[in-house]
Amino acid sequence: SIPWNLERIIPAWHQTEEDRSPDGSSQVEVYLLDTSIQGAHREIEGRVTITDFNSVPEEDGTRFHRQASKCDSHGTHLAGVVSGRDAGVAKGTSLHSLRVLNCQGKGTVSGTLIGLEFIRKSQLIQPSGPLVVLLPLAGGYSRILNAACRHLARTGVVLVAAAGNFRDDACLYSPASAPEVITVGATNAQDQPVTLGTLGTNFGRCVDLFAPGKDIIGASSDCSTCFMSQSGTSQAAAHVAGIVARMLSREPTLTLAELRQRLIHFSTKDVINMAWFPEDQQVLTPNLVATLPPSTHETGGQLLCRTVWSAHSGPTRTATATARCAPEEELLSCSSFSRSGRRRGDWIEAIGGQQVCKALNAFGGEGVYAVARCCLVPRANCSIHNTPAARAGLETHVHCHQKDHVLTGCSFHWEVEDLSVRRQPALRSRRQPGQCVGHQAASVYASCCHAPGLECKIKEHGISGPSEQVTVACEAGWTLTGCNVLPGASLTLGAYSVDNLCVARVHDTARADRTSGEATVAAAICCRSRPSAKASWVQHHHHHH
Amino acid sequence: QDEDGDYEELMLALPSQEDGLADEAAHVATATFRRCSKEAWRLPGTYIVVLMEETQRLQIEQTAHRLQTRAARRGYVIKVLHIFYDLFPGFLVKMSSDLLGLALKLPHVEYIEEDSFVFAQ
């Protein structure tokens, strides 16, 4: 007897299970930055501390009438979604409310910053258990709001934010665009993106995942026993904040990077109809609906990876795009993608002590994306091996020459602008296992890692006939770490990873010109982490149609 | 995101107005002014002055005080509404936009962001 949204995010085996904190561990605390709330509501009574924090702008209009039930509506509902007894995700969680939104649901960047600072001060004065901060609000892109979120996240606080209800790119809004924040879009009971009047959920590369956000039943501030449904990315974010609270109550030492990776890994995949999003955003938007993951005790030892897209480089001739992993993650591979196919490849370089994935636009190109594969590899030692471009049409190759290091990804970067002279590079494992091979005028980069029990293999899939894309998936138990396109006769747009699927994209116009003998190949590097085993290279599998 | 998307960044390296302060005249503004790309969401007159990451507590207060002093010399009253110590060094100030050029030239200033609205989602 549970509402659709809870049924969707809490798998059957979790529904009766209580997430109790281990003995002696501190309780998870959720901080809600929103409107005022009705703390006496039956759903949340005894679970909520209404702090004395209040930093809101004046309401608009001279005749505005402050009605408590209206002032409390948004915050009360969200508090109920997080920790409500009947309709909450994390029923036992204690919640602290900070008022940063006025009775009209309006706040300021400065008020939100002061609220975040209040949380930091509370943390310094009285260190407690894990903290989750729910930010069910959005404004225009703000460098300082994003920076404040970054600073707070680096103290171990987990921030969850609404993607925004503007049917727009979430990267244009804050705190949704802050990389350190878990940004949540909204889906409905049919797992489709939420429409809200003429607008709807935000989307794009700054969204980490989606969660229920349409017709969500929760506490209503009309009375202490009233319930109502509300819709929006706030409700979606509240679901994820509740999931995170439950994860942390079971395992208080989980880090932000682990939480995000587990949320992504255990989410329901490929149920969202991507056609709802603008065409240029479809590839950037995650097709993921949140579910409560099992504990690491039940699923330990898995290699977890996610795909991080850069911002678009822009069309200038030397425009570059940069994709970064979180500090705790390893950058296991870097690829690039351009809608026009005019790109000069990708590479990994160190900036400020951190490896980043870079992609370069080509003359006449409309711009590129850098696509990083970011993974959690315990006790990893990773390095990049680079071979500069060879002269006179010779191929360039590079392999992992350090003992016990395995190849996790290849990158290729062309020195020349002329797309006609180059044959795009290849990852030719048939010649030598664990080797990246490029053709003339290409610099080749191999990502090599050593970690206990890490083993990898290459899996290829080629299609000779006309096709806009070629895909290859890693089988169950293996995780995709690298994805490249090995071209046939046609111009390739690039390659990227979608969950465990390597997607190689081919230029539409080239399809008619194809000769059947020249297959375009998607090449995936699939890795797994076997506990208490040596790192090893497994001979690849390839298969062509 | 790393790049500042749909976001206004304005370089206000305005010529120093003489007020007899050598250090002010010598300090060229490398700091930037930022504001929300959506005009209706802007709150002109309230600014978040963000200082360099390593700025010490005392320097934050000194910078805010220095801005007040220099503004007063020009006949402007400014109000420091909040000082940020714990998450980032900076302060929130209510002042005329006429003073932005002056504020950007203060030592330790990394950028100034005009306050803007956020909304329940």
Epitope: R42, R85, D86, I217, D222, C223, C226 | -
Partner: antibody, heavy 117, light 107 residues
């Protein structure tokens, strides 16, 4: 499966006392408000009392406040209704119910209490 | 106490018909209203809570609407198994109070 089982009622003299109990199973008892509702044969439903999660807060029908006490034992998953100074108008079928979304979503099978000399 | 009034003690209908039962509160109860079905010899069964939310497992021919003081419970196409007594109940403020009930019968 959620189950609420009321204890046997019975015939009692006017002025006497009786304690009803309701044993809950199939859900986390301490997570729910619980209530008693009664129904006079061939008549409508009348709410009697409810109790919050930990027993620290109770509400009653005004006319019954002085004679009826609702309580709970979360360790044993049992809800009680202590009735004293019983009157003939207390004759009814007594239902124990679980409250969810402030409505009563699960009901026991009911137990018949007859107050008569 | 809030008084709940179901103006019709009985309502006659035919199978397949649409039928609506009304309930009026003596004061504003927002949307804090539930509807129950009781068949002879059985305990009441929750159908609708918070005026318009169908409880889990309840067929979608049952709907509720209204807020404030006036509420309606509708069965879009009456089935044989729907013949029962229907009660409204406010959960806005204690003591919770029920309407007198409306018995649905076949013409």
């Amino acid at each position: 499966e959620v189950k609420l089982v009321e204890s046997e009622g019975g015939l009692v003299q006017p002025g006497s006392s009786m304690k009803l109990s309701c044993t809950a199973s199939g859900f986390t008892f301490s997570d729910y408000y619980m209530a008693w509702v009664r129904q006079v044969p061939e008549k409508g439903l009348e709410w009697v009392a409810n109790i919050n999660y930990d027993g620290s807060n109770t509400s009653y029908l005004d006319s019954l406040k002085s004679r009826f006490i609702i309580s709970r034992d979360n360790a044993k998953n049992i809800l009680y209704l202590q009735m004293s100074s019983l009157k003939s108008e207390d004759t009814a079928t007594y239902y124990c119910a679980r409250e969810k979304f402030a409505a009563m979503d699960y009901w026991g099978q009911g137990t018949s209490v007859t107050v008569s000399s | 106490d809030i008084v709940m009034t179901q103006s019709h003690k009985f309502m006659s209908t035919s199978f397949g018909d649409r039928v609506s039962i009304t309930c009026k509160a003596s004061q504003d109860v927002s949307n804090a209203l539930a509807w129950y079905q009781q068949k002879p010899g059985h305990s009441p069964k929750l159908l609708i809570f918070s005026a318009s939310y169908r409880y889990t497992g309840v067929p979608d021919r049952f709907t509720g609407s209204g807020s404030g003081t006036d509420f309606t419970f509708t069965i879009s196409s009456v089935q044989a198994e729907d013949l029962a007594v229907y009660y409204c109940q406010q959960h806005y403020s204690t003591p919770w109070t029920f309407g007198g009930g409306t018995k649905l019968e076949i013409k």
